[in-house]
């Protein structure tokens, strides 16, 4: 959320964020690294335009203007220099002036060899257990946020993995209203709306970053998971990858995975929602995972199929009003599953990225708590890549994506709940190899996709 | 002054392990990633892993994997190279050397001087 | 796991002269690729960061240069002192494997 730099009575006080690159006389002598010409401490620039009237409590709400609640002034970097405090380049550039293009290379976890595989469990586990080098998380609300004693920030060190649940769960939690009030819930920054692509692109992109720095590893990628397959099971649910299904329990990972230790943080929902507090780094149970085990729901208990994807790609407008979940003919929508896969609106369809969540049946199809599995990770590198196809075969025509009135958190201009430093969607509304510095090693089925006899 | 000083020469047995040792000083091991490579006698260099002794998190080289074993003591400055199951083509001279932690500078820019492990019954 | 080329394996030249040594790695690395001098039985010693950087102390003889998958060390108006081993290394992804080295002899 923040920078562990700018968690301090002076900076939450002062309302700025702008930490020193390199500071040879002293604190506040090279704020965004002004010394080198990287960037500048500059007032932060948030989205004021209106938001769709679903969203009632304006006022009440951290996440509302993000991030003046907290912060007025941040870094603002020249050219290709990025980061907290400007020392690091945009993605896909690097070197001592950020000059110099790369490109990393996103693959199917299924094609990868064995010691790719892994090398790639292994580096989320150690995600899992390393504290963000960066970021710290806040566990109160902005008007608790310096403690009992108005002199003790409320803030924690969180795993570089936890962190990138806390995040998810940030940007979909209810918005607190009071003790004894029930706490709103009709509102999600980066669900159920344009925002929905670019908001977990960037999330992404993120984790991605932190974990090439964890092991130094600049070629380092997330690779996805191609759930388009029509099965009714989870191809990438064995030891060697994402855990394979416990035989003394069916609703645990065996005990073989990794991922069999890991424990969930963000399940506390119910204190958050009557007491007010934050998710801490707090862990507690279990993953849960059932894939296609919901008896209840048969639509669920199978994943989507491949011409379901070749499907949403035709489907030309990025977005449709109401913007929402509701929206007909929205390539986000249909993508995001609230849409059939040609773009129909249908309140009783789960398609594609919702599909692919529901299926898993556990801890991965709950939406405060879905990164915890972190099939998530790849369950979303996929998703991206469907969005990638998309802005490479419509030019990124961002036309479609509203300037105002979207749901809260969703306008064009809004900066994305709750990533430091401020970044918009229109940011991460741009084809990924020619911007960001990745790109997928995919081929996509063709509408008249069939099963050889 | 940067410097790592590493433990003196090792002669062991086959089968046995042996832990050396590098002591650092003129900078504070938190701030680095400390690696370790091997040269075998008259041959090239070869990467063995690295630690990061702020977390003591590690990363090795596959044919590492399993003989190999780093470990860091931040009170003391000091960062460890265990290795088992020796055999003669263990012999070899090991390296300590440290990376900017900012993982964007591509370069070991301090090396210990060595230490001689010999394998042999 | 990216492989790397070191070429010539060992070459010999005169005081003075202009020699390269070259590494191919087996993928795109860009830039991340480090080259360093050993003396006989003394530690590898850092030359050259980011393919063309050089390390601080390091005469201005020495140059790096290249991309993608081609890199080269130049050494000009060569000295005596010059002799030794060359590695180069990448740091592009996991393993950070070593080039075999080239043999320098000063004539």
């Known amino acids: 959320q923040f920078p562990r730099q700018c968690a301090t009575v002076e900076a939450l006080r002062s309302g700025m964020c702008c930490p020193d690159l390199s500071p040879v006389s002293g604190p506040g002598t090279d704020r965004c690294g002004s010394s080198s010409g990287r960037g500048r401490c500059e007032a932060v620039t948030a989205d004021s335009r209106p938001h769709s009237p679903q969203y009632p409590h304006d006022g009440r709400d951290d996440r509302e203007v993000w991030p003046l609640r907290f912060f007025n002034r941040t870094c603002h970097c020249n050219g290709n220099f990025s980061g907290h405090n400007c020392g690091t380049c945009r993605p896909g550039w690097r070197g001592a002036a950020c000059d110099q293009r790369v490109l990393i290379v996103r693959r199917n976890l299924l094609d990868l060899s064995k010691e790719e595989k892994n090398h790639f469990v292994r580096a989320l586990d150690m995600a899992k257990r390393t504290t963000h080098p960066l970021f710290v998380i806040a566990t109160r609300r902005s008007e608790e946020i310096l403690g009992p004693d108005g002199n003790t920030p409320q803030f924690e060190n969180i795993s570089i993995y936890n962190y990138f649940v806390w995040t998810h769960y940030y940007s979909v939690k209810k918005t607190f209203l009071g003790v004894g009030q029930e706490s709103f819930g009709e509102v999600d920054f980066s669900h159920e709306g344009p925002a929905f692509l670019t908001w977990h692109r960037y999330h992404l992109l993120r984790l991605e970053k932190d974990m090439q720095e964890m092991l130094q590893e600049p070629s380092f990628s997330l690779p996805y998971w191609n759930f388009a397959t029509g099965k009714n099971v989870c191809d990438i649910c064995t030891d060697d990858l994402m855990g394979s299904r416990s035989n003394f329990d069916s609703t645990l990972i065996s005990p073989n995975s990794v991922f069999s230790q890991w424990r969930v943080v963000c399940d506390s929902l119910e204190d958050y929602d009557t007491l007010g507090t934050l998710c801490n780094s707090t862990e507690d149970g279990p993953i849960r995972r059932n894939p296609a085990g919901n008896v209840a729901r048969p639509m669920v208990q199978r994943l989507p199929e491949p011409q379901d994807v070749a499907q949403c790609l035709e489907v030309g407008l990025f977005d449709t009003p109401p913007f929402y979940s509701n929206s007909t003919n929205s390539f986000r929508n249909t993508v995001e599953g609230y849409s059939d896969p040609t773009g129909k609106y249908d309140p009783a369809v789960r398609s594609l990225h919702n599909l692919a969540h529901l299926f898993l049946n556990g801890t991965g199809g709950q939406t405060h708590l879905s990164p915890n599995d972190p099939i998530f990770v790849l369950l979303h590198t996929f998703t991206d890549a469907v969005f990638d196809e998309w802005l490479r075969r419509y030019n990124a025509d961002i036309s479609t994506f509203p300037l105002e009135n979207a749901p809260i958190g969703h306008n064009r201009q809004y900066n994305m709940v709750p990533f430091w430093p401020p970044v918009t969607n229109t940011e991460m509304f741009v084809t990924a190899p020619d911007n960001l510095g990745y790109t997928y090693e995919i081929q996509w089925p063709s509408r008249e996709f069939s099963v050889p006899e | 002054e940067v410097q790592l000083q590493q433990s003196g020469a090792e002669l062991v047995r086959p089968g046995a392990l042996v832990k050396l040792s590098c002591k650092t000083s003129?900078?504070?091991?938190?701030?680095?990633?400390l690696h370790w490579v091997r040269q075998r006698p008259d041959q090239g260099l070869e990467w063995i892993g690295w630690i990061n002794p702020d977390n003591g998190n590690t990363v090795y080289d596959p044919k590492f994997q399993g003989t190999a074993s780093l470990t860091a003591d931040t009170s003391s400055n000091t960062v460890y190279l265990q290795l088992s199951g020796l055999t003669s083509e263990d012999t070899a001279v090991y390296f300590c050397?440290?990376?900017?932690?900012?993982?964007?500078?591509?370069?070991?820019?301090?090396w210990g001087q060595g230490t001689t492990v010999t394998v042999s019954s | 796991d990216i492989q790397m080329s070191q070429s010539p394996a060992s070459l010999s030249a005169s005081v003075g002269e202009t020699v390269t040594i070259t590494c191919r790695a087996s993928?795109?690395?860009?830039?991340?690729l480090a080259w360093y001098q050993q003396k006989q039985g003394k530690s590898p010693h850092l030359l050259v960061y980011?393919?063309?950087t050089l390390a601080d102390g390091v005469p201005s003889r020495f140059s790096g240069s290249g991309s993608g998958t081609q890199y080269s060390l130049k050494i000009s108006s060569l000295q005596t002192e010059d002799s030794g081993n060359y590695y180069c290394?990448?740091?592009?992804?996991?393993?950070?494997?070593f080039g075999s080295g080239t043999k320098l002899e000063i004539k």
């Open positions: 980011d393919a063309k």
């Open positions: 290394q990448h740091f592009w992804s996991l393993p950070f494997t």
């Open positions: 003129g900078f504070n091991i938190k701030d680095y990633f």
């Open positions: 993928g795109n690395i860009y830039n991340y």
């Open positions: 050397t440290r990376r900017d932690y900012t993982y964007e500078k591509a370069a070991l820019d301090y």
